[in-house]
């Protein structure tokens, strides 16, 4: 490797090796390597090996170290938002009102206008303004899947609160799916978490945009704060530029 | 600031400012700043400001950028594991067998032996060996809370699989609680996810350590692979060392 | 990404992750780590040219900015980006210990 | 942590985050970014002494290793650790745009 000065790769390796010597000892807070004089002879005990192996092996559901930022994520993302279809739309009539759920639908033509291609979407968040809440509530988010079936997405434990607060759910994968499909209207369901034993499954939390009887200015403010999708995406022209200039250095 | 050479702070600032000029433009993929000739006069539209503000504000449940690693986390963690109390223990008799749940109890004296003080615990994982699974199953993990009440912790969507696979749940906070309390036995419950509408709430997944009728060697292997807590903690002596040597440079 | 997949199979002169296997006994003269016998530590090496000034030909800069100075540093530097932990087994006196050391394996580098 | 809380209130000579506010109009001569008017970009500066060799007085090394060369680099470098994004509002022609720029604000530094 050359820069202005020639880099001595072997010297760098030696310095790295010496630094690792210090790194390991300092991480273990050892001033010097432990003496091996009293280490029992023979192989490591089975229990120790089993423990080592379970530490070494990645298992399903365990979070790995954060992934490096992909090249495309370096570039700025355009931010847009798509408001939920208003609750007087006929789409809501198909879903029976229930004490345990509320429904939120989105117009995919608006989504496509904001993000022309699924691959451009970098992040999508569903944002809901929750009003004050008297008791702790465990809620679940579902995605409308087929005619009358719903797919579980995530959950949240909401602490009691005296003031309104925005909630955010990462729905990037779902919105990417919607952009790939031909549907006109897609939706989410927010439900109370239902335990197998419990009978009281009422959704206590009040989400802005679902309460009735507001008039005039208040209704407008209320409507603007109704659930929306916050989208971050690479603008199409930038993505085309990226594609044409993508090369291995 | 001095090193071998004196650092010219003003020069560094100027270089950083110039670099930011390039950084912003390159992130936006603009070869030059956009012309302002056609910008409408007056303040920014309300909708644009609202969008800007919702992008700028952090909201509950949204993941922030990863936190910097605390000093204590730099140092190595000792890894230990505590096996679940075996299923023939009388503690299990108190919990009625059900089709939707299995129970896992742990001896807190064993936990305290591994981690003498709650503050030393850096990570605790509940690990379960799931056997082959024919259908997709959505499971939930609960913590035993008081006499007969359970607190929801997390959930997992298990894909069908022909081979056994380890599952891992982060239960650091729970184990830290247990270490702070006086209880002798503490436990978890793994349940089928019960939808508010659905009636079929059977726990289909087979977790190693709960099936009956094994004999001899097979029983031993089965027992060793029963659910366990994998604990990562700062050894007591290192924590004391850390405390005594903690100072501002 | 300047990761092992790309860097180990290329002759990249600029910032990249470089191969380095540490054998505890041979390289460090240590016999006290019982498992593993060694590990792929790797390291970051290579220049991160400073590529912005008012008189730079900007079209050339745009394509390179992400790689050479994404953080807009006054003196960009080739440093680790993705790191992985390393579990080890060793004895203290007669007692075996399993410990996990964070950030020991360099998987990718970046100019920062 | 070498963060704004510590660094801005100390006279730390080694690697630390340093204050830098960018006023888009004054510092960059730009009037095209409508929001914000500027931002606290900050930057990392200060030496990361290479502090390991076989003959080092080790008791001194232990306390410093975490800060000066936690990644065991052959040439440690003062670089950003925690970064935050910056949303901006600007116009392209008559059309306002809100965009989020990743990794624009340096909150803390590290030797890497």
């Amino acid at each position: 490797l050359s820069t202005c000065k020639t880099i001595d790769m072997e010297l760098v390796k030696r310095k790295r090796i010496e630094a690792i010597r210090g790194q390991i000892l300092s991480k273990l807070r050892l001033a010097s390597p432990p003496s091996q004089g009293e280490v029992p002879p023979g192989p490591l005990p089975e229990a120790v090996l089993a423990l080592y192996n379970s530490t070494r092996d990645r298992v399903a559901g365990e979070s790995a170290e954060p992934e490096p930022e992909p090249e495309a994520d370096y570039y700025a993302k355009e931010v847009t938002r798509v408001l939920m279809v208003e609750t007087h739309n006929e789409i809501y009539d198909k879903f029976k009102q229930s004490t345990h759920s509320i429904y939120m639908f989105f117009n995919t033509s608006e989504l496509r206008e904001a993000v022309p291609e699924p691959v451009l979407l970098s992040r999508a968040e569903l944002r809901l303004l929750r009003l004050k809440l008297k008791v702790e509530q465990h809620v679940e988010l579902y995605q409308k899947y087929s005619n009358n079936s719903w797919r579980y997405l995530s959950n949240r434990l909401l602490a009691p609160s005296d003031s309104p607060e925005w909630l955010s759910f990462d729905v990037t994968g779902v919105v990417r799916q919607w952009l790939s499909r031909g549907g006109e209207i897609e939706g989410f369901r927010l439900s109370a978490h239902c335990s197998c034993d419990s009978r009281d499954n009422t959704l206590q939390v009040d989400i802005n945009g679902f309460t009735t009887g507001r008039r005039g200015d208040l209704a407008t403010i209320h409507g603007m704060n109704r659930p929306f999708l916050l989208l971050m995406a690479t603008p199409l022209e930038r993505a085309q530029h990226l594609q044409s200039s993508r090369h291995r250095r | 600031l001095s090193t071998c050479k004196t650092i010219d702070m003003e020069l560094v600032k100027r270089k950083r400012i110039e670099a930011i000029r390039g950084q912003i433009l390159s992130k936006l993929r603009l070869a030059s700043p956009p012309s302002q000739g056609e910008v409408p006069p007056g303040p920014l539209p309300e909708a644009v400001l609202a969008l800007y503000n919702s992008t700028r504000d952090r909201v509950a449940g949204e993941s922030a950028e990863p936190e910097p690693e605390p000093e204590a986390d730099y140092y190595a963690k000792e890894v230990t594991r505590v096996l679940m109390v075996e299923t023939h223990n009388e503690i299990y008799d108190k919990f009625k067998q059900s089709t939707h749940s299995i129970y896992m109890f742990f001896n807190t004296s064993e936990l305290r032996e591994a981690v003498p003080e709650p503050v030393l615990l850096s990570r605790a994982e509940l690990r379960l060996l799931r056997l082959k699974l024919k259908v997709e199953q959505h499971v939930e993990l609960y913590q035993k809370y008081s006499n007969n009440s359970w607190r929801y912790l997390s959930n997992r969507l298990l894909a069908p699989s022909d081979s056994p696979e380890w599952l891992s749940f982060d239960v650091t906070g729970v184990v830290r609680q247990w270490l702070s309390r006086g209880g002798e036995i503490e436990g978890f419950r793994l349940s089928a996810h019960c939808s508010c509408d659905s009636r079929d709430n059977t726990l289909q997944v087979d977790i190693n350590g709960f099936t009956t009728g094994r004999r001899g060697d097979l029983a031993t292997i089965h027992g060793m692979n029963r659910p366990f807590l994998l604990l990562m903690a700062t050894p007591l002596e290192r924590a004391q060392h850390l405390q005594s040597s903690r100072h501002r440079r | 990404a300047l990761d092992t997949n790309y860097c180990f199979s290329s002759t990249e002169k600029n910032c990249c992750v470089r191969q380095l296997y540490i054998d505890f006994r041979k390289d460090l003269g240590w016999k006290w780590i019982h498992e593993p016998k060694g590990y792929h530590a790797n390291f970051c090496l290579g220049p991160c040219p400073y590529i912005w000034s008012l008189d730079t030909q900007y079209s050339k800069v745009l394509a390179l900015y992400n790689q050479h100075n994404p953080g807009a540093s006054a003196a960009p530097c080739c440093v680790p980006q993705a790191l992985e932990p390393l579990p080890i087994v060793y004895y203290v006196g007669r007692k075996p210990k399993v410990e996990q050391l964070s950030n020991m394996i360099v998987r990718s580098c970046k100019c920062s | 942590a070498l963060d704004t809380n510590y660094c801005f209130s100390s006279t730390e000579k080694n690697c630390c985050v340093r204050q830098l506010y960018i006023d888009f109009r004054k510092d960059l001569g730009w009037k095209w970014i409508h929001e914000p008017k500027g931002y606290h970009a900050n930057f990392c500066l200060g030496p990361c002494p290479y502090i390991w060799s076989l003959d080092t007085q080790y008791s001194k090394v232990l306390a410093l290793y975490n800060q000066h060369n936690p990644g065991a680099s052959a040439a440690p470098c003062c670089v950003p650790q925690a970064l935050e994004p910056l949303p901006i509002v600007y116009y392209v022609g008559r059309k306002p745009k809100v965009e989020q720029l990743s990794n624009m604000i340096v909150r803390s530094c590290k030797c890497s």
């Epitope: 010097s32 390597p33 091996q36 004089g37 | - | - | 076989l54």
Partner: antibody
Framework: EVQLVQSGAEVKKPGASVKVSCKAS????????MHWVRQAPGQGLEWMGR????????KYAQKFQGRATLTVDTSTSTAYMELSRLRSDDTAVYYC???????????WGQGTLVTVSS | DIQMTQSPSSLSASVGDRVTITCRAS??????LNWYQQKPGKAVKLLIY???RLETGVPSRFSGSGSGTDYTLTISSLQPEDFATYFC?????????FGQGTKLEIK
């Protein structure tokens, strides 16, 4: 301050036994092994054995197996070394020393002179 | 058992002199080599552990080096309080063994 304070000098007849004490202070007694080392007049240092105060586990140098007995009293943070069937060549200064797992003795007692003479 | 051979057995030097004492092990001891100072009527004092690590509070004129089977203790500039007997000890393999000692006397 970490300290090891040993009992006073002893004069014994051949065939007798001697018991030397070593009181530890300034650290957690059960966290470190205690070793015993002796030095005959004009000679080098010779390792005799060690005791783990936590488990009571003991290891002797082959030469002293069967003649030396190491014990501890954790309530008083005291270690003891008893040497039986004394011979004249057992005349030496006996040291207790705290063992660091790095492979060294970081704290030593002041030594106890045991003279074996008829 | 590992044999430790220390040389010289005695040494005369003056204040300000640079002094070197060596210790050879009968097999590789992987840097687990320690140096102690002994003065009449005083407790033995650890100077250097693991070949080159200076024990806290020990003056920096003391230094250690070596690897494999050969190790060295160096006093860069002798001070009056340095006249004493010095021992090496291996901490690699049981039983722990010591060198015969080097008596450092005033010339």
């Amino acid at each position: 301050e970490v300290q090891l304070v040993q009992s006073g000098a002893e004069v014994k007849k051949p065939g007798a036994s001697v018991k030397v004490s070593c009181k530890a202070s300034g650290y957690t007694f059960t966290s470190y092994d205690m070793h015993w080392v002796r030095q005959a007049p004009g000679q080098g240092l010779e390792w005799m054995g060690r005791i783990d105060p936590q488990s009571g586990g003991i290891k002797y140098a082959q030469k002293f197996q069967g003649r030396a007995t190491l014990t501890v009293d954790t309530s008083t943070s005291t270690a003891y070394m008893e040497l039986s069937r004394l011979r004249s060549d057992d005349t030496a200064v006996y040291y207790c020393a705290r063992w660091d797992y790095g492979g060294y003795f970081d704290v030593w007692g002041q030594g106890t002179l045991v003279t074996v003479s008829s | 058992d590992i044999q430790m051979t220390q040389s010289p057995s005695s040494l005369s030097a003056s204040v300000g002199d640079r002094v070197t004492i060596t210790c050879r092990a009968s097999q590789d001891i992987y840097n687990y080599l320690n140096w102690y100072q002994q003065k009449p009527g005083k407790a033995v004092k650890l100077l250097i552990y693991y070949t080159s690590r200076l024990e806290t509070g020990v003056p920096s004129r003391f230094s250690g080096s070596g690897s494999g089977t050969d190790y060295t203790l160096t006093i860069s500039s002798l001070q009056p309080e340095d006249f004493a007997t010095y021992f090496c000890q291996q901490g690699d393999t049981l039983p722990w063994t010591f060198g015969q000692g080097t008596k450092l006397e005033i010339k």
